[in-house]
Interface confidence: low
Amino acid sequence: DAHKSEVAHRFKDLGEENFKALVLIAFAQYLQQCPFEDHVKLVNEVTEFAKTCVADESAENCDKSLHTLFGDKLCTVATLRETYGEMADCCAKQEPERNECFLQHKDDNPNLPRLVRPEVDVMCTAFHDNEETFLKKYLYEIARRHPYFYAPELLFFAKRYKAAFTECCQAADKAACLLPKLDELRDEGKASSAKQRLKCASLQKFGERAFKAWAVARLSQRFPKAEFAEVSKLVTDLTKVHTECCHGDLLECADDRADLAKYICENQDSISSKLKECCEKPLLEKSHCIAEVENDEMPADLPSLAADFVESKDVCKNYAEAKDVFLGMFLYEYARRHPDYSVVLLLRLAKTYETTLEKCCAAADPHECYAKVFDEFKPLVEEPQNLIKQNCELFEQLGEYKFQNALLVRYTKKVPQVSTPTLVEVSRNLGKVGSKCCKHPEAKRMPCAEDYLSVVLNQLCVLHEKTPVSDRVTKCCTESLVNRRPCFSALEVDETYVPKEFNAETFTFHADICTLSEKERQIKKQTALVELVKHKPKATKEQLKAVMDDFAAFVEKCCKADDKETCFAEEGKKLVAASQAALGL
């Protein structure tokens, strides 16, 4: 439906508060280095302009596209070239090239200081002094650090953030009330950002068809009682929402997401029996709840898939008539029967089925050729099952920290060219799969583990894309979205790697390590472990374990010493010498 003024349309649909919040997120995700005050000024200007268009849709410039209006506004920033360098060249382009240019300059790892949490009293005072500015600052800081964060979901996080401060700043023990809530929001926020980053990568690097296939599989698992036509409609709408958000069209995205939630709730009888509670919630909570809703029960009397997809004489005819529809139905039917499979496994099975039909439908006897296609699925299913079984056993044996260390060693040996901070971050997240998924029963382990690993490996891919250093990483990241995890699993030690020169400075520690949180201390030790492996890629597990045990003892001893700094200096030298000897450096 065409509107005379797109900006007026979105302002009216979303309301002033959401409009301003979404424009702030959009601007912060594009210009990640700009000060908060500059963004607020730009947002206020856009908002005032939108209000004039609401009053009179025929007013000057009100007919311009949102990209034109927002791009023009971003290009008024005086320090664009000094701050962003070549991104300033985007402003010489016309839409839609200008917006594409801004999108290409989004930085997944911006050079921004770590967010340090102030004292609780300081935060509560700031909250009470100016609640609106306090919450805007939250949106700004998250959006600029996570330029692909799902904008309507960030509004939901901000609502919870506000609720936490409203409740806890009045509590007797403010810190006890607030800090766990903030930790939870931080961890959930990081997870949400990473999940959305995979959706955007899927759309941008592999195209709409890849995203739609993912969505068909996931929604079919979640809504196994919904018929194919219903799932197809949801997939089409969901694809539009994510395409918009990933493309920086945040107002349209939030508006369309609200429409989709409304549609789902109005049609829940033909979608899922699990939606009732979600649909009673306010909009932001409703949309979040729907996105996280548990899988509905599978219908009891589903027929065998073989009849329609293997035994039928019409398989090639049906496939030829509408290839993607037929494959979509196959994926839907397989997925709704297998909530115990990961989405990526289901997509591998569908790809195998497609490849078989492409080959067999051109053969002399197609049926004879594809008759055993389901047998080809067995090894594809068993591979992740076995991998998860082995790794969960290892996790249960080692615990999370040591399991992360095992993965650090494994991945550093596979791709030693990758930067140490990236290897630490990615391996720590890979290691979290243990506590996240191994507690689940068999039927839930694979979808939990393998789909989570897809999200984490995508982090590696997007970070590596910014500064490519390893052909092996590039190959695994770009060849096939659904085979990324098997591709990385299949990598062996990189025999071509020339070990890094030994640098004693890398292994020099100071008393400040003693005041770090347990998590920060782990990261320091894990950073040292990666560096050790880079120096000695052929070191055995036993050698590395001995060095790490010595290192842990050294930190513990010096943190208890009266003169910590001297202890770190003297004992550190001894540790480095002993480690060199142990590893033959």
Partner: nanobody, 114 residues
Framework: EVQLVESGGGLVQPEGSLRLSCRAS????????MGWYRQPPGKEREFVAR??????HYADSVKGRFTISRDNAKNTVYLQMNSLKPEDTAVYYC?????????WGEGTLVTVSS
């Protein structure tokens, strides 16, 4: 191409029963939705019932009185209509959904009258 042929319509007394059949031929597979719509005299076509593996849906006006079923081996869908009322009088159309469109039969007339 898909062809659908309905049968089983006719004249029946109020509170009586009828069983409609619809046989599909052509490019058919059992996992697709099949079902029934009807068009009362002088009114728009309206949804009656549909069936999908493991799932059935009914219009509120027929719930508890009509039962849809399917025989995949015969590519046939049935509509068992009990406790018929005069307002059930209509041409009943069978449909089959594939590739984002519905295929329709020619229709069979059901008249409920004393």
């Amino acid at each position: 191409e898909v062809q659908l042929v309905e049968s089983g319509g006719g004249l029946v007394q109020p509170e009586g029963s009828l069983r409609l059949s619809c046989r599909a031929s052509g490019s058919i597979f059992s996992i697709n939705t099949m079902g029934w719509y009807r068009q009362p005299p002088g009114k728009e076509r309206e949804f009656v019932a549909r069936i999908y593996p493991g799932i059935t849906h009914y219009a509120d006006s027929v719930k508890g009185r009509f039962t849809i079923s399917r025989d995949n081996a015969k590519n046939t869908v049935y509509l068992q209509m009990n406790s018929l009322k005069p307002e059930d009088t209509a041409v009943y159309y069978c449909f089959y959904y594939y590739d984002d469109r519905n295929y329709w039969g020619e229709g069979t007339l059901v008249t409920v009258s004393s």
